[in-house]
Amino acid sequence: CEAPPTFEAMELIGKPKPYYRVGERVDYKCKKGYFYIPPLATHTICDRNHTWLPVSDEGCYREMCPHIRDPLNGEAILANGSYEFGAELHFICNEGYYLIGKDILYCELKDTVAIWSGKPPLCEKILCTPPPKIKNGKHTFSEVEVFEYLDAVTYSCDPAPGPDPFSLIGESMIYCGNNSTWSHAAPECKVVKCRFPVVENGKQISGFGKKFYYKATVMFECDKGYYLNGSDKIVCESNSTWDPPVPKCLKVSTSPTTKSPTSSASGPRPTYKPPVSNYPGYPKPDEGILNNLDD
């Protein structure tokens, strides 16, 4: 027989030879990191037909790391389903808890013993320090010193000393989240007031108000014979300016050779279409179709 078979978990006892006589026996032992559990044979014999009798390494089992219990308020998950060396043990914490230590342990061989690569981690309760205090405002539970996971506070603005109220800019409700941090930055309380939006040759059609505070929304339309240059809808933003800017109403061109500018993509269509004679491929009529429009 030629050289005997090799195995992942078993190795030959003694030095291998290039050739073996019929009836000659070779013995195996489990490799380092494996241990033997009977009854499977760990030897083979060179048979009369010059082949080795069947043998397998299935009696050699990997060394195992000790079982680790789930951490309190968490879970230990075996990545490949067994505790044999080479295994990975992943740790996760329940919602509201965070991990202290390594989130993965590896089952490793030290000499002939399988041991874990470190100490199992702990799951600690997520706690937050009080959220920031804000100028011209306050938050609920201001007397609480420690907040637990998902505990929420709501901010509100104080009454303003002047005629215009404080607006709350940002998230009014924030909660204690992962990493013991608050879900959002604290909001801001300040007076936000936009100027009265004046549009020549047009007018406001919605969002009427005494004054225009934070997030006030106004819509416009142009007079007949004028088209909107800009957006028909504007919003009062936190820096007390309109966004997009207040639009303009421009006169629709009556010249058959000059093309009227079009309104922005976000805005509405012109309130009166420019004459078709402005476009290539159309014949130019003798009389401009807009000549009799009221101003």
Partner: antibody, heavy 118, light 107 residues
Framework: EVQLVESGGGLVQPGGSLRLSCAAS????????ISWIRQSPSRGLEWLGV???????NYNSAFMSRFTISRDDSKNTAYLQMNSLKTEDTAVYYC????????????WGQGTLVTVSS | AIQLTQSPSSLSASVGDRVTITCRAS??????LNWYLQKPGQSPQLLIY???SLFSGVPDRFSGSGSGTDFTLKISRVEAEDVGVYYC?????????FGQGTKVEIK
């Protein structure tokens, strides 16, 4: 509190020109939106136009071709330039501080009289 | 331009009377209407803005109401110092325009 004082009124012949001034004291003219309004017995109160803090202007289209509003920040003064004056332009002319960016006329000057007559 | 028509053009009231002045717009102006009083020999002064909001320092015997095209200024108990000409003004659309005025006298 800013005070606005109009000046430059007087007698002018038809077809003539006149420049009215609106001087601000106790504040900067560039910090306020300034409107010009006139009043006559025959035509009542008429809004002429406004110059905004950013220097932009809006006019009453009835006067746009003849009247121009401007501002000189170094002199802390707003102006109303009136050309091609007609007899019907005879009126008391007021400059007025628009209330906080809103078209509410809360702070009127004492007015200056313009008489257009031959 | 939007026209504002005031009525009556003049009225005479006794001290303590309730006075009502109306202002009608030629088209809808939402609540974008102000009221002014011009006392004899003085410049106009703002009384009410945005239909019903009292300007600072204005006595609460003055009140405004209305919406759209029809607006009212009421003086609950007129006083001698309330004499003068009352004007309405719209600001929904340029040019901003005034009513022709209502003259209030005390009997």
């Amino acid at each position: 509190e800013v005070q606005l004082v109009e000046s430059g009124g007087g007698l002018v012949q038809p077809g003539g020109s006149l420049r009215l001034s609106c001087a601000a004291s106790g504040g900067s003219v560039s910090s306020y939106d300034i409107s010009w309004i006139r009043q006559s017995p025959s035509r009542g109160l008429e809004w002429l136009g406004v110059i905004w803090t950013d220097g932009g202007t809006n006019y009453n289209s009835a006067f746009m071709s003849r009247f121009t509003i401007s501002r000189d920040d170094s002199k802390n003064t707003a102006y109303l330039q009136m050309n091609s004056l007609k007899t019907e332009d005879t009126a008391v002319y007021y400059c007025e501080r628009v209330y906080d960016g809103y078209p509410w006329f809360a702070y009127w000057g004492q007015g200056t009289l313009v008489t257009v007559s031959s | 331009a939007i026209q504002l028509t005031q009525s009556p053009s003049s009225l005479s009231a006794s001290v303590g009377d309730r006075v009502t002045i109306t202002c009608r717009a030629s088209q809808g102006i939402s609540n974008y209407l102000n009221w002014y009083l011009q006392k004899p020999g003085q410049s106009p002064q703002l009384l009410i803005y945005y239909t019903s909001s009292l300007f600072s320092g204005v006595p609460d015997r003055f009140s405004g109401s209305g919406s759209g095209t029809d607006f009212t200024l009421k003086i609950s108990r007129v006083e001698a110092e309330d004499v003068g000409v009352y004007y309405c003004q719209q600001y929904i659309k340029l040019p901003w325009t005034f009513g022709q005025g209502t003259k209030v006298e005390i009997k």
